[in-house]
């Protein structure tokens, strides 16, 4: 997704001569190349732009379909419940909403990558804000779920169930409010900008370099490091409790715990490592050179795609690892009169009809 104005060094004549001789695109320079004035090589965008043009539209289209179907199914299963949702289920519903809203913007970014931004500045601001709101919301809601389970299992404190039902809603509202706050720069600085170098219009940030670096640091800390630390801390303690109590159900639950954290970490760590490299280059801690700049651009595209896959991964995890989710899904299909499911009219074997499919208790962790 193109969300930031790219920047290039001002070429001097030695570099233009190299460009005219047509070898600059395949030329690689040493890692310790100095970034003194204009002696660094030209960094043609051709490769990374062509890569984006080919790779991103296909990936975004696939993720759009998978994310919409998967998260739609999760929302449908949760909303089809006749009883009140548990705290974890409420967070999961909000997570499904966040992931759905995020994938809804992907077709726009696919068009932006393939051709140009044709939707105007208004939609650019909305789509950019929506994208980042839900990027942050996804991570923070996962942190909330882990904290809820941590209190639930480690401290045997059912914070949200024992308190007023509004407490979980307030927590979710606080998360959305915080995400809206994080997305303010999008509303202010995003616009459809005609790039005369590329002779195309793109939805891009339009603010000073300092702001750009600050926003990336915020994204790295608030959207990844903080939620990951919360998840790691909470789930490490949950694992400790489950390991002490042993038992097959708990061991199965332990596997699920690991899957949740690992999925988030695997999907988002590569992207944030690339962002970290870019931040270090922005701050001058890492020297810029053509090879590195080109590799970072391509790596950003690949790893961000991997990150967005996380939106589609949650429903798959519930479906393949969460027994209760599958059962609820079958029940929903039966209720909708799905012809292929008529022979499957059996009661769920491992849970009461009104139990939460993601519920976590000290005795049982069949969550997700």
């Amino acid at each position: 997704m193109v969300l930031e104005v790219s920047d290039h060094q001002v070429l001097n004549d030695a570099e233009v001569a190299a460009l005219l001789e047509n070898f600059s695109s395949s030329y690689d320079y040493g890692e310790n190349e100095s970034d003194s004035c204009c002696t660094s090589p030209p960094c043609p965008q051709d490769f990374s732009l062509n890569f984006d043009r080919a790779f991103l539209p296909a990936l975004y289209s696939l993720l759009f379909l998978l994310g919409l179907l998967g998260n739609g199914a999760v929302a449908a299963v949760l909303l089809s419940r006749r009883t009140a949702l548990s705290s974890t289920d409420t967070f999961l519903l909000h997570l499904a909403v966040a992931d759905t809203l995020l994938v809804l913007t992907l077709p726009l970014w696919a068009v932006d990558a393939a051709v140009q931004w044709v939707f105007g500045s208004g939609l650019c601001k909305v789509a950019g804000a929506l994208f980042n709101i839900n990027f942050y919301a996804g991570a923070l809601l996962l942190a909330c779920i882990s904290f809820d389970r941590y209190l639930n299992i480690v401290h045997a404190t059912q914070l949200y169930r024992r308190g007023p039902p509004a407490r979980v809603t307030l927590t979710c509202l606080a998360v959305w409010g915080l995400c809206l706050l994080f997305a303010l720069p999008d509303f202010i600085f995003l616009s459809a900008h005609h790039d005369e170098r590329l002779n195309a219009t793109h939805c891009q940030y339009n603010f000073p370099q300092v702001g750009r670096t600050a926003l990336r640091v915020l994204q790295l800390v608030a959207g990844f490091l903080l939620p990951l630390l919360v998840m790691a801390y909470c789930y490490a303690h949950i694992l400790a409790v489950l390991l002490v109590s042993r038992g097959q159900r708990r061991l199965r639950a332990m596997r699920l715990v690991v899957v949740v954290v690992v999925a988030f970490a695997l999907c988002w760590t590569p992207y944030h490592l690339v962002v970290l490299v870019d931040i270090l280059m922005d701050l001058g801690a890492l020297a810029r050179n053509c090879g590195r700049e080109s590799r970072v651009d391509v790596a950003k595209s690949v790893t961000s795609g991997l990150g967005y896959m996380h939106c589609c991964l949650n429903p798959l995890l519930y479906a393949f690892v969460g027994v209760k989710f599958r059962e609820r899904m079958w029940m929903l299909l039966l209720r909708l009169g799905c012809p292929n499911q008529r022979g499957l009219q059996r009661q769920p074997s491992s849970s009461r009809r009104d139990s939460s499919w993601s519920e976590t208790s000290e005795a049982s962790y069949s969550g997700l």
Partner: antibody
């Protein structure tokens, strides 16, 4: 029509500071690298500073490095030059100049210039 | 630093004359650029990439050269050509200008 309008010049004492601005119009400011070039009274031209189109890269000659800072606000289509520790030899007309686009990147000559703003450093 | 030395510094000529201004570089440069400046005005790009005329520059102007020596030639001097001409290199930092050649009416 491309227009560059400098402002902020004036009389300043040695050791003092001054901030010059250059308001750009008639072109997509965010697509172009920009520079400041100065001309001492009755003398030739001297390159002072350059900034890349996104503001990530800045370049200076040794004569001003550490004293002058070039920056830009792409939202306001404005280029700045913050001048600190001014010396008598910094007295000049300061021009804001645009770099043309070349082959997807930038070339170092200047295709458009502003009318200039006079900075006088004197006690 | 690459020093650019223009010669002559002053040149008196008449309308219709053929005029050549030379710019010598202390080290080899890839390209040379020429600017025209009239009194009290900002410089204007005149010739870029050694020989390419900027938009609106009459065809009587031409540029040539390579390495250390470059020239700007006016085949038939016109009244509007009287001005100061500066050469500039952008091969290595700092990006320097020549001291200028002032073209005056004889």
């Amino acid at each position: 029509e491309v227009q560059l309008l400098e402002s902020g010049g004036g009389l300043v004492q040695p050791g003092g500071s001054l901030r010059l601005s250059c308001a750009a119009s008639g072109f997509t400011f965010t697509s172009y690298a920009m520079s400041w070039v100065r001309q001492a009274p009755g003398k030739g031209l001297e390159w002072v500073a350059t900034i890349s189109h996104g503001g990530r890269y800045t370049y200076y000659p040794d004569s001003v490095k550490g004293r002058f800072t070039i920056s830009r606000d792409n939202a306001k289509n404005t280029l700045y030059l913050q001048m600190n520790s001014l010396r008598a030899e910094d007295t000049a007309v300061y021009y804001c100049a645009r770099h043309p686009i070349y082959s997807g990147n930038y070339q170092g000559y200047f295709d458009y210039w502003g009318q200039g703003t006079l900075v006088t450093v004197s006690s | 630093d690459i020093q650019l030395t223009q010669s002559p510094s002053f040149l008196s000529a008449s309308v219709g004359d053929r005029v050549t201004i030379t710019c010598r570089a202390s080290s080899g440069v890839n390209y040379l650029y020429w600017y025209q400046q009239k009194p009290g005005k900002a410089p204007k790009l005149w010739i870029y990439f050694t020989s390419t005329l900027a938009s609106g520059v009459p065809s009587r102007f031409s540029g040539s050269g390579s390495g250390n020596e470059y020239t700007l030639t006016i085949s038939s001097l016109q009244p509007e050509d009287f001005a100061t001409y500066y050469c500039q290199q952008f091969t290595s930092s700092p990006y320097t200008f020549g001291q200028g050649t002032k073209l005056e009416i004889k």
